[in-house]
Amino acid sequence: LPSCKEDEYPVGSECCPKCGPGFHVRQACGEQTGTVCEPCSPGTYIAHFNGLSKCLQCQMCDPAMGLRTSRNCSTTANALCGCSPGHFCIIQDGDHCAACRAYATSSPGQRVQKGGTESQDTLCQNCPPGTFSSNGTLEECQHGTKCSKWLVTEAGPGTSSFRWV
Protein backbone atom coordinates (compact mmCIF):
# COMPACT_ATOMS: atom_id res chain seq x y z
CA LEU A 1 0.00 0.00 0.00
CA PRO A 2 1.21 3.53 -0.69
CA SER A 3 2.10 5.85 2.15
CA CYS A 4 -0.68 8.44 2.02
CA LYS A 5 -1.02 11.80 3.75
CA GLU A 6 -3.35 12.03 6.74
CA ASP A 7 -6.14 13.56 4.63
CA GLU A 8 -5.82 10.93 1.88
CA TYR A 9 -6.53 7.20 1.77
CA PRO A 10 -5.02 4.38 -0.30
CA VAL A 11 -6.75 3.05 -3.42
CA GLY A 12 -4.60 0.44 -5.12
CA SER A 13 -1.21 2.07 -5.56
CA GLU A 14 -2.62 5.60 -5.46
CA CYS A 15 -3.77 8.01 -2.76
CA CYS A 16 -7.22 9.62 -2.97
CA PRO A 17 -8.51 12.66 -1.08
CA LYS A 18 -10.79 11.65 1.78
CA CYS A 19 -14.45 12.57 2.09
CA GLY A 20 -15.49 14.91 4.85
CA PRO A 21 -17.50 14.07 7.99
CA GLY A 22 -21.08 13.21 7.09
CA PHE A 23 -20.06 11.78 3.70
CA HIS A 24 -18.87 8.41 2.43
CA VAL A 25 -17.08 7.52 -0.80
CA ARG A 26 -19.46 7.07 -3.72
CA GLN A 27 -16.64 6.73 -6.24
CA ALA A 28 -12.91 6.53 -5.56
CA CYS A 29 -10.62 8.91 -7.37
CA GLY A 30 -9.08 7.88 -10.66
CA GLU A 31 -6.72 9.10 -13.35
CA GLN A 32 -8.96 12.04 -14.22
CA THR A 33 -11.51 12.30 -11.43
CA GLY A 34 -11.31 13.16 -7.77
CA THR A 35 -13.11 11.36 -4.96
CA VAL A 36 -16.87 11.61 -5.35
CA CYS A 37 -18.58 11.66 -1.98
CA GLU A 38 -22.17 11.04 -0.97
CA PRO A 39 -23.98 12.29 2.14
CA CYS A 40 -24.80 9.75 4.84
CA SER A 41 -28.46 8.79 4.84
CA PRO A 42 -30.63 9.28 7.94
CA GLY A 43 -29.77 6.76 10.65
CA THR A 44 -26.12 6.62 9.60
CA TYR A 45 -23.08 8.80 10.33
CA ILE A 46 -19.34 9.30 9.84
CA ALA A 47 -17.62 11.59 12.33
CA HIS A 48 -14.21 11.94 10.66
CA PHE A 49 -12.51 12.49 7.30
CA ASN A 50 -12.65 9.09 5.69
CA GLY A 51 -12.33 6.73 2.75
CA LEU A 52 -15.25 4.54 3.77
CA SER A 53 -17.62 3.13 1.16
CA LYS A 54 -20.52 3.07 3.64
CA CYS A 55 -21.61 5.22 6.53
CA LEU A 56 -21.83 3.65 9.99
CA GLN A 57 -25.14 2.73 11.59
CA CYS A 58 -26.25 5.00 14.41
CA GLN A 59 -26.48 3.19 17.72
CA MET A 60 -29.91 2.69 19.26
CA CYS A 61 -30.49 3.43 22.93
CA ASP A 62 -32.49 0.42 24.14
CA PRO A 63 -34.97 1.27 26.92
CA ALA A 64 -34.92 -2.42 27.91
CA MET A 65 -31.28 -1.86 28.91
CA GLY A 66 -32.29 1.17 30.98
CA LEU A 67 -30.98 3.51 28.28
CA ARG A 68 -32.31 6.73 26.83
CA THR A 69 -30.94 8.94 24.02
CA SER A 70 -28.93 11.82 25.47
CA ARG A 71 -27.78 13.07 22.04
CA ASN A 72 -29.56 12.33 18.78
CA CYS A 73 -27.58 10.84 15.92
CA SER A 74 -26.62 13.24 13.12
CA THR A 75 -24.77 12.47 9.89
CA THR A 76 -21.54 13.61 11.57
CA ALA A 77 -21.93 12.18 15.09
CA ASN A 78 -23.24 8.97 16.60
CA ALA A 79 -26.10 9.02 19.08
CA LEU A 80 -25.08 9.07 22.72
CA CYS A 81 -26.94 7.00 25.30
CA GLY A 82 -27.46 7.88 28.92
CA CYS A 83 -29.30 6.15 31.72
CA SER A 84 -33.04 6.52 32.05
CA PRO A 85 -34.22 8.29 35.22
CA GLY A 86 -33.82 6.00 38.22
CA HIS A 87 -30.95 4.07 36.58
CA PHE A 88 -27.15 4.09 36.81
CA CYS A 89 -24.49 2.95 34.34
CA ILE A 90 -23.11 -0.55 34.74
CA ILE A 91 -21.18 -0.78 31.42
CA GLN A 92 -19.22 2.29 30.36
CA ASP A 93 -18.18 2.48 26.68
CA GLY A 94 -15.80 5.38 26.21
CA ASP A 95 -17.76 8.57 26.82
CA HIS A 96 -21.18 6.93 26.82
CA CYS A 97 -23.08 4.15 28.55
CA ALA A 98 -23.88 0.74 27.04
CA ALA A 99 -26.09 -0.62 29.82
CA CYS A 100 -27.81 0.72 32.92
CA ARG A 101 -29.48 -0.82 35.96
CA ALA A 102 -32.30 0.49 38.12
CA TYR A 103 -31.27 1.97 41.45
CA ALA A 104 -31.45 -0.39 44.42
CA THR A 105 -34.42 0.29 46.68
CA SER A 106 -33.57 0.56 50.35
CA SER A 107 -35.52 -1.93 52.45
CA PRO A 108 -37.68 -0.99 55.41
CA GLY A 109 -35.29 -0.58 58.30
CA GLN A 110 -32.73 1.15 56.05
CA ARG A 111 -32.11 4.74 55.08
CA VAL A 112 -30.77 6.22 51.83
CA GLN A 113 -27.22 7.14 52.77
CA LYS A 114 -26.44 8.50 49.28
CA GLY A 115 -28.85 8.94 46.38
CA GLY A 116 -28.11 7.26 43.05
CA THR A 117 -26.32 9.13 40.28
CA GLU A 118 -25.68 8.46 36.57
CA SER A 119 -22.69 6.36 37.56
CA GLN A 120 -23.42 5.09 41.06
CA ASP A 121 -26.18 3.04 42.66
CA THR A 122 -28.16 4.18 45.67
CA LEU A 123 -26.23 3.51 48.90
CA CYS A 124 -28.36 2.07 51.71
CA GLN A 125 -27.54 1.95 55.44
CA ASN A 126 -29.31 0.13 58.27
CA CYS A 127 -31.12 2.35 60.74
CA PRO A 128 -29.26 2.63 64.05
CA PRO A 129 -30.90 1.23 67.22
CA GLY A 130 -33.76 3.35 68.48
CA THR A 131 -34.64 4.64 65.01
CA PHE A 132 -36.80 3.32 62.21
CA SER A 133 -37.64 3.69 58.50
CA SER A 134 -40.86 2.11 57.35
CA ASN A 135 -40.35 2.38 53.56
CA GLY A 136 -36.63 2.72 52.86
CA THR A 137 -36.95 5.97 50.92
CA LEU A 138 -35.99 8.35 53.71
CA GLU A 139 -32.60 10.00 53.98
CA GLU A 140 -32.79 9.95 57.77
CA CYS A 141 -34.26 7.27 60.04
CA GLN A 142 -36.85 8.54 62.48
CA HIS A 143 -36.64 8.17 66.22
CA GLY A 144 -39.07 5.70 67.80
CA THR A 145 -41.79 6.97 70.18
CA LYS A 146 -40.85 7.04 73.88
CA CYS A 147 -43.68 6.15 76.26
CA SER A 148 -44.62 8.88 78.69
CA LYS A 149 -44.13 8.32 82.40
CA TRP A 150 -47.88 8.00 82.80
CA LEU A 151 -47.96 4.83 80.70
CA VAL A 152 -47.09 1.73 82.61
CA THR A 153 -46.14 -0.66 79.79
CA GLU A 154 -45.19 -0.60 76.15
CA ALA A 155 -47.54 -2.41 73.82
CA GLY A 156 -44.54 -4.11 72.23
CA PRO A 157 -40.87 -3.65 71.40
CA GLY A 158 -39.91 -1.34 68.54
CA THR A 159 -37.87 -2.52 65.57
CA SER A 160 -35.88 -0.64 62.93
CA SER A 161 -38.84 -1.08 60.60
CA PHE A 162 -41.85 -0.53 62.84
CA ARG A 163 -42.78 1.72 65.70
CA TRP A 164 -44.84 0.30 68.56
CA VAL A 165 -46.96 2.63 70.57
Epitope: E8, K18, G34
Partner: antibody, heavy 117, light 108 residues
Framework: EVQLLESGGGLVQPGGSLRLSCAAS????????MHWVRQAPGKGLEWVSS????????DYADSVKGRFTISRDNSKNTLYLQMNSLRAEDTAVYYC??????????WGQGTLVTVSS | EIVLTQSPGTLSLSPGERATLSCRAS??????LAWYQQKPGQAPRLLIY???NRASGIPDRFSGSGSGTDFTLTISRLEPEDFAVYYC??????????FGQGTKVEIK
Protein backbone atom coordinates in the same frame (compact mmCIF):
# COMPACT_ATOMS: atom_id res chain seq x y z
CA GLU B 1 -18.86 24.13 -31.05
CA VAL B 2 -20.50 23.36 -27.68
CA GLN B 3 -23.34 25.79 -26.93
CA LEU B 4 -25.24 26.33 -23.68
CA LEU B 5 -28.01 28.93 -23.51
CA GLU B 6 -29.65 29.81 -20.20
CA SER B 7 -33.09 31.42 -19.90
CA GLY B 8 -35.78 32.06 -17.28
CA GLY B 9 -34.04 34.66 -15.14
CA GLY B 10 -35.71 37.86 -14.00
CA LEU B 11 -36.98 39.86 -11.05
CA VAL B 12 -38.84 37.97 -8.34
CA GLN B 13 -40.01 38.83 -4.82
CA PRO B 14 -38.56 37.11 -1.74
CA GLY B 15 -40.37 33.82 -1.19
CA GLY B 16 -41.17 33.56 -4.89
CA SER B 17 -40.19 30.94 -7.48
CA LEU B 18 -38.39 30.80 -10.83
CA ARG B 19 -37.50 28.02 -13.23
CA LEU B 20 -34.26 28.33 -15.17
CA SER B 21 -33.60 26.39 -18.37
CA CYS B 22 -30.38 25.63 -20.20
CA ALA B 23 -30.62 24.51 -23.82
CA ALA B 24 -27.60 22.49 -24.95
CA SER B 25 -26.43 21.86 -28.49
CA UNK B 26 -23.44 20.64 -30.53
CA UNK B 27 -22.57 17.78 -28.17
CA UNK B 28 -24.13 14.54 -26.90
CA UNK B 29 -26.01 16.02 -23.96
CA UNK B 30 -27.02 12.64 -22.52
CA UNK B 31 -23.36 11.66 -22.03
CA UNK B 32 -22.40 14.48 -19.71
CA UNK B 33 -22.99 15.53 -16.14
CA MET B 34 -24.37 19.06 -15.93
CA HIS B 35 -24.07 21.76 -13.29
CA TRP B 36 -25.40 25.11 -12.15
CA VAL B 37 -22.91 27.68 -10.84
CA ARG B 38 -23.86 31.17 -9.69
CA GLN B 39 -22.11 34.47 -9.19
CA ALA B 40 -23.54 37.21 -6.99
CA PRO B 41 -22.91 40.77 -8.27
CA GLY B 42 -19.25 41.66 -7.77
CA LYS B 43 -18.56 38.35 -6.01
CA GLY B 44 -16.89 35.02 -6.78
CA LEU B 45 -18.17 31.75 -8.21
CA GLU B 46 -20.37 29.41 -6.15
CA TRP B 47 -21.32 25.88 -7.16
CA VAL B 48 -25.08 25.34 -6.79
CA SER B 49 -26.02 21.88 -8.04
CA SER B 50 -24.98 18.92 -10.18
CA UNK B 51 -26.78 16.10 -11.97
CA UNK B 52 -25.20 13.03 -13.57
CA UNK B 53 -25.85 12.08 -17.20
CA UNK B 54 -28.76 9.72 -16.43
CA UNK B 55 -29.98 11.68 -13.36
CA UNK B 56 -28.73 8.85 -11.10
CA UNK B 57 -27.03 11.23 -8.70
CA UNK B 58 -27.98 14.76 -7.75
CA ASP B 59 -26.09 17.05 -5.39
CA TYR B 60 -26.81 20.49 -3.97
CA ALA B 61 -24.89 23.15 -2.09
CA ASP B 62 -26.08 23.44 1.52
CA SER B 63 -27.21 27.01 0.81
CA VAL B 64 -29.92 25.84 -1.62
CA LYS B 65 -30.75 22.34 -0.34
CA GLY B 66 -34.49 21.84 0.11
CA ARG B 67 -35.32 24.94 -1.97
CA PHE B 68 -33.80 24.26 -5.40
CA THR B 69 -34.36 21.24 -7.63
CA ILE B 70 -32.13 20.32 -10.57
CA SER B 71 -33.46 18.12 -13.37
CA ARG B 72 -32.80 17.32 -17.02
CA ASP B 73 -34.63 16.10 -20.08
CA ASN B 74 -32.17 14.26 -22.29
CA SER B 75 -34.73 13.98 -25.10
CA LYS B 76 -34.91 17.80 -25.22
CA ASN B 77 -31.20 18.43 -24.49
CA THR B 78 -32.28 20.71 -21.65
CA LEU B 79 -31.16 21.24 -18.07
CA TYR B 80 -33.47 22.86 -15.50
CA LEU B 81 -33.22 24.53 -12.10
CA GLN B 82 -36.47 25.00 -10.17
CA MET B 83 -35.89 27.66 -7.51
CA ASN B 84 -38.43 28.04 -4.70
CA SER B 85 -38.52 30.14 -1.50
CA LEU B 86 -36.10 32.59 -3.08
CA ARG B 87 -34.10 34.92 -0.84
CA ALA B 88 -32.25 38.17 -1.45
CA GLU B 89 -28.95 36.27 -1.16
CA ASP B 90 -29.93 34.13 -4.18
CA THR B 91 -29.53 37.20 -6.40
CA ALA B 92 -26.84 36.25 -8.93
CA VAL B 93 -26.01 35.39 -12.49
CA TYR B 94 -26.75 31.68 -12.90
CA TYR B 95 -24.53 29.75 -15.29
CA CYS B 96 -25.13 26.26 -16.57
CA UNK B 97 -21.94 24.34 -17.24
CA UNK B 98 -21.06 21.05 -18.85
CA UNK B 99 -19.24 18.71 -16.51
CA UNK B 100 -16.31 16.56 -17.43
CA UNK B 101 -14.58 14.59 -14.68
CA UNK B 102 -15.53 17.14 -12.02
CA UNK B 103 -14.56 20.09 -14.21
CA UNK B 104 -16.67 22.74 -15.89
CA UNK B 105 -15.28 22.61 -19.40
CA UNK B 106 -17.96 24.70 -21.15
CA TRP B 107 -20.17 27.44 -19.73
CA GLY B 108 -23.25 29.30 -20.89
CA GLN B 109 -23.37 33.09 -20.85
CA GLY B 110 -25.59 33.13 -17.76
CA THR B 111 -29.01 34.47 -16.79
CA LEU B 112 -29.55 37.09 -14.08
CA VAL B 113 -31.88 36.32 -11.18
CA THR B 114 -32.80 39.30 -8.97
CA VAL B 115 -34.67 38.68 -5.72
CA SER B 116 -36.04 41.94 -4.36
CA SER B 117 -39.23 43.45 -3.03
CA GLU C 1 -15.95 21.41 2.89
CA ILE C 2 -12.55 22.14 1.39
CA VAL C 3 -11.75 25.85 1.52
CA LEU C 4 -9.53 27.33 -1.19
CA THR C 5 -7.62 30.51 -0.40
CA GLN C 6 -6.15 32.49 -3.30
CA SER C 7 -3.38 35.04 -3.03
CA PRO C 8 -2.79 37.78 -3.70
CA GLY C 9 -6.25 39.30 -3.98
CA THR C 10 -5.03 41.67 -6.68
CA LEU C 11 -1.90 41.55 -8.81
CA SER C 12 -0.84 44.77 -10.57
CA LEU C 13 1.52 44.03 -13.45
CA SER C 14 2.51 45.31 -16.87
CA PRO C 15 2.17 43.46 -20.18
CA GLY C 16 5.17 41.21 -20.77
CA GLU C 17 5.68 40.56 -17.04
CA ARG C 18 5.37 37.22 -15.33
CA ALA C 19 2.32 36.57 -13.11
CA THR C 20 2.35 34.05 -10.28
CA LEU C 21 -0.96 33.22 -8.62
CA SER C 22 -1.33 30.98 -5.57
CA CYS C 23 -4.14 28.71 -4.41
CA ARG C 24 -4.00 26.89 -1.07
CA ALA C 25 -6.47 24.18 0.00
CA SER C 26 -7.54 23.60 3.61
CA UNK C 27 -6.78 19.89 3.13
CA UNK C 28 -5.40 17.71 0.36
CA UNK C 29 -7.20 17.74 -2.99
CA UNK C 30 -4.58 15.48 -4.58
CA UNK C 31 -3.92 16.66 -8.15
CA UNK C 32 -7.58 17.54 -8.72
CA LEU C 33 -7.45 21.30 -9.09
CA ALA C 34 -8.53 23.50 -11.99
CA TRP C 35 -7.98 27.13 -12.92
CA TYR C 36 -10.48 29.39 -14.71
CA GLN C 37 -10.21 32.81 -16.30
CA GLN C 38 -13.11 35.28 -16.23
CA LYS C 39 -13.27 38.60 -18.04
CA PRO C 40 -15.86 41.29 -17.18
CA GLY C 41 -19.32 40.43 -18.49
CA GLN C 42 -18.21 37.00 -19.67
CA ALA C 43 -18.55 33.42 -18.44
CA PRO C 44 -15.51 31.72 -16.90
CA ARG C 45 -13.23 29.71 -19.17
CA LEU C 46 -11.34 26.54 -18.17
CA LEU C 47 -7.54 27.03 -18.38
CA ILE C 48 -5.90 24.22 -16.39
CA TYR C 49 -7.11 20.88 -15.01
CA UNK C 50 -5.44 18.15 -12.94
CA UNK C 51 -3.22 20.86 -11.50
CA UNK C 52 -0.99 21.19 -14.56
CA ASN C 53 -2.80 20.12 -17.76
CA ARG C 54 -3.74 22.87 -20.19
CA ALA C 55 -7.30 22.75 -21.52
CA SER C 56 -7.92 22.68 -25.26
CA GLY C 57 -6.95 25.91 -27.04
CA ILE C 58 -5.13 27.46 -24.05
CA PRO C 59 -1.81 29.15 -24.97
CA ASP C 60 1.36 27.64 -23.51
CA ARG C 61 2.19 30.82 -21.60
CA PHE C 62 -0.28 29.48 -19.03
CA SER C 63 1.07 26.75 -16.77
CA GLY C 64 -0.03 25.14 -13.54
CA SER C 65 1.88 23.28 -10.85
CA GLY C 66 1.42 21.79 -7.42
CA SER C 67 -0.44 18.97 -5.68
CA GLY C 68 -1.97 18.26 -2.31
CA THR C 69 -2.67 21.66 -0.76
CA ASP C 70 -0.45 24.14 -2.64
CA PHE C 71 -0.95 25.12 -6.27
CA THR C 72 0.37 27.82 -8.57
CA LEU C 73 -0.81 29.30 -11.85
CA THR C 74 1.92 31.03 -13.82
CA ILE C 75 1.47 33.29 -16.83
CA SER C 76 4.98 33.56 -18.26
CA ARG C 77 4.47 36.78 -20.26
CA LEU C 78 1.28 38.74 -19.77
CA GLU C 79 -0.62 39.66 -22.91
CA PRO C 80 -3.22 42.47 -22.88
CA GLU C 81 -6.04 39.89 -23.07
CA ASP C 82 -4.77 38.12 -19.94
CA PHE C 83 -5.90 40.87 -17.57
CA ALA C 84 -8.87 39.26 -15.86
CA VAL C 85 -9.97 37.47 -12.68
CA TYR C 86 -8.62 33.95 -12.10
CA TYR C 87 -10.34 31.32 -9.95
CA CYS C 88 -9.08 27.98 -8.70
CA UNK C 89 -11.56 25.13 -8.16
CA UNK C 90 -11.12 21.80 -6.41
CA UNK C 91 -12.75 18.54 -7.39
CA UNK C 92 -10.58 16.31 -5.22
CA UNK C 93 -13.35 15.64 -2.71
CA UNK C 94 -16.84 16.66 -3.69
CA UNK C 95 -19.58 17.63 -3.13
CA UNK C 96 -19.36 20.38 -2.46
CA UNK C 97 -17.27 21.56 -5.37
CA UNK C 98 -15.54 24.69 -4.13
CA PHE C 99 -13.87 27.71 -5.71
CA GLY C 100 -11.27 30.13 -4.41
CA GLN C 101 -12.33 33.75 -3.95
CA GLY C 102 -10.41 34.84 -7.05
CA THR C 103 -7.29 36.85 -7.93
CA LYS C 104 -7.64 39.93 -10.09
CA VAL C 105 -4.75 40.55 -12.49
CA GLU C 106 -4.85 44.23 -13.43
CA ILE C 107 -2.72 46.51 -15.58
CA LYS C 108 -0.19 48.46 -13.56
Amino acid sequence: EVQLLESGGGLVQPGGSLRLSCAASEFTFSSYAMHWVRQAPGKGLEWVSSITSASSYIDYADSVKGRFTISRDNSKNTLYLQMNSLRAEDTAVYYCARGTRGLFDHWGQGTLVTVSS
Amino acid sequence: EIVLTQSPGTLSLSPGERATLSCRASRSVGKYLAWYQQKPGQAPRLLIYLGSNRASGIPDRFSGSGSGTDFTLTISRLEPEDFAVYYCQQYGSSPPITFGQGTKVEIK
